[in-house]
């Protein structure tokens, strides 16, 4: 057979040949970082001629072209500079908002050598919608400008850019957009390992957190009971072994998967791992139905024994069959455990697909994904029970659209990635679960299943009491510190007599702790403004208690996430460079923010935190409170910007004994404390000894009920001063380096 000509050099780059100059050989070009090859490859045809995939005309000279990042197509409610058609590597684009709009995301973004922008989409939002403004990523066009419950927005990419993420999103009842942010990227772009590792890792650690990590397995316990107690994770690893995957690549796939398995077993969760290699047909090396799938040594052994030659007779890429074998495994397990049982329904499923290209046989893999979603009953409520990560390796033949179609779409997360080569994949797996350092005290995980106890739903909630009667509530913010209100300690009684009850006082989980030290804000003085006719003033109503021992983490005792910390950043699944301001913009992101506090009887009650102009009207009614504030001229003397305000509409009001407890929000199935209960105009428990009885204020009451909570975003310096060694705090805001 004729060989292909050898005049195929690329100026400024290099090339490799899969099978020399013979027909069937694939010539692959590569360029230095910041440049990309055009064309990317050529194939030696049996005629002895080179063919360029997708090219219409005959052989053109191969060149290394400069990578560029896409320009904004439109930017709402603000301006961006400079305005270019596309941006060179290292180039910046800056965003500013019009008056009345707050900038969420990155004010300055830089074009990176892989053709992708750093930071996150800049959005100018006024917080008026039920959902936050979803923004328009660079290079995208959005249709749909209403952000109310049920409203939809659609995205497409300009020119030849490829869309990854969701092309359509819907504003859901919980104020979160369905799916994941769409990104428009150059067809030749790929992801850097340092971006993929934290994205994969935080998504994974969230899932591990939701699986209730720290329950040690008691060997004597029946396994099904154990699954019911603390959830279970099925991890399915799918390794491409088709012809285009070299033996070297396959070895690194194996090493990467082994690393993943090793890390996953280091979390104290119940996990079963399935291993499937595939080419034209799948080969199940380990099934979740096999008891050995729970044994790390056995799983790694099955990976170790995976042989590159297992698939030498069928060399296509049948991704459908690989995913379908996962579906069949799930089906068998469901039949075994029983479709209606908690043992089946509480299993979370994660699929990691490692592939080097597009499926070329067996039909659409999307069909298998649809079957999997169906069998697991994945809907908005159960969205967290399935994660599919689609990871393409090698820039050449990877089909972005197919990967994107297969990967899960979740708000604030990415599940589809393309890496330059298998070594980059290995780097990702080496670093993706470094967050394991944090999992022992993983924050903000509450059990949300219907049969969970109150304490399991809010495991951070603690009761603070002197020797006699109960007085205050508080929140665990680490394994040894409790955040509460300063006014609980205003009688100055010796705190050595006080006790903190952690876990449910009504069960064996409840445990009394002594207080090693109380740190009460020096600024708190209830009588500070007495001579201004303000009989009680609650500025700086914040205190920290250090417990005499560390709390053993369990499903009944676990810290809540404090915003502006690295721990909360992971739980929010935000990028690494995030700031305290970013957290505030994300958590308090509209004019009425749904939140909760915990009642005396342990149940979770609902409030709405009023922001912006609504905060002003919420606080204004304090002027009608003539007993406490006889001659008040300025409401802001009492309600400073340290306070969050609730109590309008259908809000519940906290009772006296609920002071110091957390005011918290739920985001992405995790819980974040934004405030603490301080004071109010109405006590619904007045005159009742029954913890379960609360009286709503009559509609005609003057002043109407209002409740004020210390805003933790306004207490950052004090929190940092005392918790700097306990939590990892983020910078307060971005420091911009303008490049001129």
């Amino acid at each position: 057979a004729p060989s292909c000509p050898q005049n195929v050099n690329i100026s400024g780059g290099t090339f490799t040949l899969s099978h020399g100059w013979a027909p069937g050989s694939l010539l692959t070009y590569s360029c230095p970082q910041g440049l990309y090859p055009s064309p990317a490859s050529r194939l030696c045809k049996s005629s002895g001629q080179w063919q360029t995939p997708g090219a219409t005309r005959s052989l053109s000279k191969a060149v290394c072209k400069p990578v560029r990042c896409p320009a904004p197509v439109s930017f709402e409610n603000g301006i961006y500079t400079p305005r270019l058609g596309s941006y060179p590597v290292g180039g910046n684009v800056s965003f500013e908002c019009e008056d009345g709009f707050i900038l969420r995301g990155s004010p300055v973004r830089q074009c990176r050598p892989n053709g992708m922008w750093d930071g996150e989409t800049a959005v100018c939002d006024n917080g008026a919608g039920h959902c936050p403004n979803p923004g328009i990523s660079l290079g995208a066009v959005r249709t749909g400008f209403r952000f109310g419950h049920g409203d939809k927005v659609r995205y497409r990419c300009s020119s030849n850019l490829v869309l990854t993420g969701s092309s359509e999103r819907e504003c859901q009842g919980n104020g979160v957009w369905s799916g994941t942010e769409p990104i428009c990227r150059q067809p030749y772009s790929y992801d850097f390992p340092e971006d993929v590792a934290p994205a994969l890792g935080t998504s994974f650690s969230h899932m591990l957190g939701a699986t209730n990590p720290t329950q040690k397995t008691k060997e004597s316990l029946g396994r099904k009971i154990q699954i019911q107690r603390s959830g279970h994770l099925n991890l399915y690893l799918l390794l491409d072994c088709s012809q285009s995957v070299s033996e070297n690549d396959f070895l690194i796939f194996k090493e990467s998967a082994s690393l993943m398995v090793d890390r996953i077993f280091s979390f104290e969760i119940n996990v079963s791992v399935a291993i499937i290699t595939f080419a034209s047909e799948p080969k199940v090396l380990m099934s979740v139905l096999n008891d050995n799938s729970r044994d790390m040594t056995e799983v790694i052994s099955s990976l170790e024994n995976a042989n590159y030659k297992d698939h030498e007779n069928g060399t296509g890429t049948n991704t459908y069959a690989a995913l379908n074998s996962v579906y069949l495994m799930m089906n068998n397990q469901m039949r075994l455990l029983g479709m209606e049982t908690m043992a089946w329904q509480e299993i979370r499923h994660a699929i990691i697909l490692l592939t080097d290209g597009k499926s070329n046989m067996g039909g659409s893999p999307k069909t298998a994904v649809d079957h999997i979603r169906e069998i697991l009953n994945i809907n908005q409520k159960r969205n967290d029970y399935l994660d599919i990560y689609a990871i393409g390796v090698g820039k050449l033949d990877v089909d972005w659209r197919e990967l994107n179609e297969l990967g899960s779409k979740k708000d604030g997360e990415r599940h589809a990635f393309i890496l330059q080569d298998t070594k980059a994949l290995h780097q990702v797996f080496e670093h993706m679960l470094d967050v394991s350092k944090l999992t022992d005290t993983i924050c903000g995980v509450g059990n949300m299943s219907a049969n969970a106890s109150d304490q399991e739903r809010t495991p951070w909630h603690v009761t603070i009491k002197p020797k006699s009667q109960e007085t205050c509530r508080g929140a665990l913010i680490s394994d040894q510190w409790v955040l509460t209100a300063a006014h609980c300690f205003r009688d100055g009684n010796d705190h050595s007599l006080w006790r903190v009850n952690v876990g449910d006082p009504k069960s064996q989980w409840g445990k009394e702790f002594l207080i090693e030290k109380a740190v009460i804000s020096p600024g708190f003085d209830v009588f500070a403004k007495k001579n201004q006719g303000i009989l009680e003033f609650y500025g700086d109503d914040i205190a920290l208690l250090k417990l005499a021992q560390k709390v053993k983490m369990s499903t009944h005792a676990r810290p809540i996430c404090l915003p502006c910390t690295m721990e909360a950043n992971l739980a929010l699944r935000r990028p690494q460079g995030s700031t305290c301001r970013d957290h505030e913009n994300e958590l308090l992101n509209k004019q009425s923010v749904p939140a909760h506090f915990v009642a005396l009887n342990g149940s979770k009650l609902n409030i709405n935190l009023k922001m912006g102009v609504e905060w002003t009207s919420c606080a204004e009614v304090v002027s009608q409170e003539k007993t406490m504030f006889p001659n008040l001229t300025d409401v802001r003397e009492v309600v400073t910007d340290q306070f969050l305000c609730s109590g309008t509409q259908e809000d519940e009001s906290p009772c006296k004994g609920e002071s110091g407890g957390a005011v918290f929000l739920e985001r992405r199935f995790r819980f974040f404390q934004v405030g603490l209960v301080s004071w109010g105009l109405y006590n619904p428990c007045l005159g009742s000894a029954d913890k379960n009885s609360r009286k709503r204020a009559p509609r005609s009451k003057v002043p109407p009920p209002r409740d004020f909570h210390i805003n933790l975003f306004r207490m950052q310096p004090w929190l940092r001063q005392h918790l700097g060694d306990v939590l990892n705090f983020l910078p307060l805001h971005h420091h911009h380096h303008h490049h001129h």
Epitope: S246, K254, S258, S301
Partner: antibody, heavy 119, light 108 residues
Framework: EVQLLESGGGLVQPGGSLRLSCAAS????????MMWVRQAPGKGLEWVSS????????NYADSVKGRFTISRDNSKNTLYLQMNSLRAEDTATYYC????????????WGQGTLVTVSS | QSALTQPPSVSVSPGQTATITCSGD??????VSWYQQKPGQSPVVVIF???KRPSGIPERFSGSNSGNTATLTISGTQAMDEADYYC??????????FGGGTKLTVLR
């Protein structure tokens, strides 16, 4: 501190047998790929054999196939090399080395044990 | 015959940069480790996974690997760096492959 300590070397006649051991400490032995590498006096390094973390996968250099057997006891954190039908050309310092999880990416070496095959 | 090719010797003046190469088919697809061996001592890992330096190894040691060639670079070479250097990777079917070794001489 991660350590590998070889033992069992010595003088043996051609055709004889010897069993080398390598005691591992300072890391989770059962998770890693292990191997034996040898170095004849004044020569370069030569890979001899390797074994997967569970012991299920073994590989040998052509020069020792059928004569040497690699094994491991994860409960004792020990790697072994059973050497039979020894020849003069097997004379070398034998090193035990720790690899990755399934790859032979060596990152720790032992101090070696000398095997002399001579009549 | 070794599947990895190294130059038998490299000489360098103190303070200069020494470069030792290791070539093999599609080596860039694999991970390469580099070992330093001084007379009478066991080998020591100076670079693994192409570019990683174990703790305790000076920063002047660095590695790279692409195409068919891996390179060990010692910048600001010192007399104590005089030793034999070996590269290593894996071959097909689970075997391990070593280069023939390079004797680095630091000129006096």
């Amino acid at each position: 501190e991660v350590q590998l300590l070889e033992s069992g070397g010595g003088l043996v006649q051609p055709g004889g047998s010897l069993r080398l051991s390598c005691a591992a400490s300072g890391f989770t032995f059962s998770r890693y790929y292990m191997m034996w590498v040898r170095q004849a006096p004044g020569k370069g390094l030569e890979w001899v054999s390797s074994i997967g973390s569970s012991g299920g996968t073994t590989n040998y250099a052509d020069s020792v196939k059928g004569r040497f057997t690699i094994s491991r006891d994860n409960s004792k954190n020990t790697l072994y090399l059973q050497m039979n039908s020894l020849r003069a050309e097997d004379t070398a310092t034998y090193y035990c080395a720790k690899g990755g999880m399934v790859l032979g990416v060596v990152n720790i070496w032992g101090q070696g044990t000398l095997v002399t095959v001579s009549s | 015959q070794s599947a990895l090719t190294q130059p038998p010797s490299v000489s360098v003046s103190p303070g200069q940069t020494a470069t030792i190469t290791c070539s093999g088919d599609k080596l860039g697809e694999k991970y390469v480790s580099w070992y330093q061996q001084k007379p009478g001592q066991s080998p020591v890992v100076v670079i693994f996974q192409d570019i990683k330096r174990p703790s305790g190894i000076p920063e002047r040691f660095s590695g790279s690997n692409s195409g068919n060639t891996a390179t060990l670079t010692i910048s600001g070479t010192q007399a104590m760096d005089e030793a034999d250097y070996y590269c290593q990777t894996w071959g097909t079917g689970g075997i391990q492959v070593f280069g023939g070794g390079t004797k680095l001489t630091v000129l006096r």
